[in-house]
Amino acid sequence: RKIPKVGHTFFQKPESCPPVPGGSMKLDIGIINENQRVSMSRNIESRSTSPWNYTVTWDPNRYPSEVVQAQCRNLGCINAQGKEDISMNSVPIQQETLVVRRKHQGCSVSFQLEKVLVTVGCTCVTPVIHHVQ
Amino acid sequence: GITIPRNPGCPNSEDKNFPRTVMVNLNIHNRNTNTNPKRSSDYYNRSTSPWNLHRNEDPERYPSVIWEAKCRHLGCINADGNVDYHMNSVPIQQEILVLRREPPHCPNSFRLEKILVSVGCTCVTPIVHHVA
């Protein structure tokens, strides 16, 4: 999937745009908002009725090298008594993010943008029930 | 930056870390995924902490459309289909990387940007404190 070109209806390409070889784009990987600290709610993953654990995946040829993935702890959801209720389902919630992949071909190196699907957490859902004949 | 293992036979001039600026192929690797969460699942309706999805569009960003979740209720939906306010619907937030056109309006020049998105909601049992 290609990154869409800027539509002429909305933009005129400024003269100041850097020259870029055909079929590629210039990417500055100095991240905007890199140091922005977000105040996430504490312990949501433990207090949720569909609790989850986190696993850090690490890949030295990916930028960023660390990607955190969530896994639902249970198939069912935790009820008011703290017991698992398997009439409900814990399901993963997913979000796409971009990473830069570094590829080695012999002694040359190329860079590729890649979409990665990250599991962010879990939610408790009412299952859709089908009775099979 | 991060350290990259190198082929030992290659010249030593290569930087071990990711360079600050790279030339990247215009094609994005990894399937034409469906980025509209309304089409990919109906969890947003079936969850005990249901949410609405709001379209956030910015032509200076890739992807230009991002869907933001807003929890429908303060509490969670109980077995009777009523809102139970002793529980909380809480947004699950995630930092993601997007591309920002830099300089603005340029078709093939971008910078990575980190943004915080609410992806969905989960039902939480709060710890209760009685304030003296």
């Epitope: 105040s39 504490r42 949501i44 207090r47 | 807003k70 909380n88 809480v90 709060p126 710890i127």
Partner: nanobody
């Protein structure tokens, strides 16, 4: 430690109005929502109204919809409940609730009496 100070309770005749206020202080950051529950003797505490901190989204119990209005002041960490067209059945102890997603703080309560 979080402190909650409730004020504005009292006695009023049916059809009258009262305004309850609740101020939060201490480590009241990352607020999810702020609101009010009420309780009458021998009954469970019931939700009255709440306001989400991030976007001022409001929710009301059916029994008070159209009569009560909840509002907030972000800069002061306060929430107000304007109660109009009060009825005898609104008589209760009203509790301020500060919700931080995984932790919830309850105030000590303020008595509202509606009678002629």
């Amino acid at each position: 430690e979080v402190q909650l100070v409730e004020s504005g309770g009292g006695s009023v005749q049916p059809g009258g109005s009262l305004r309850l206020s609740c101020a939060a202080s201490g480590r009241a950051n990352s607020i999810n929502w702020f609101g009010w529950f009420r309780q009458t003797p021998g009954k469970e505490r019931e939700f009255v109204a709440g306001i989400r901190w991030s976007d001022a989204y409001t929710e009301y119990a059916n029994s008070v919809k159209g009569r009560f209005t909840i509002s907030r002041d972000n800069s002061k960490n306060t929430v107000d409940l304007q109660m109009d067209s009060l009825r005898p059945e609104d008589t209760a102890v009203y509790y301020c609730v500060l919700d931080l997603s995984t932790v919830r703080y309850w105030g000590q309560g303020t008595l509202v009496t509606v009678s002629s």
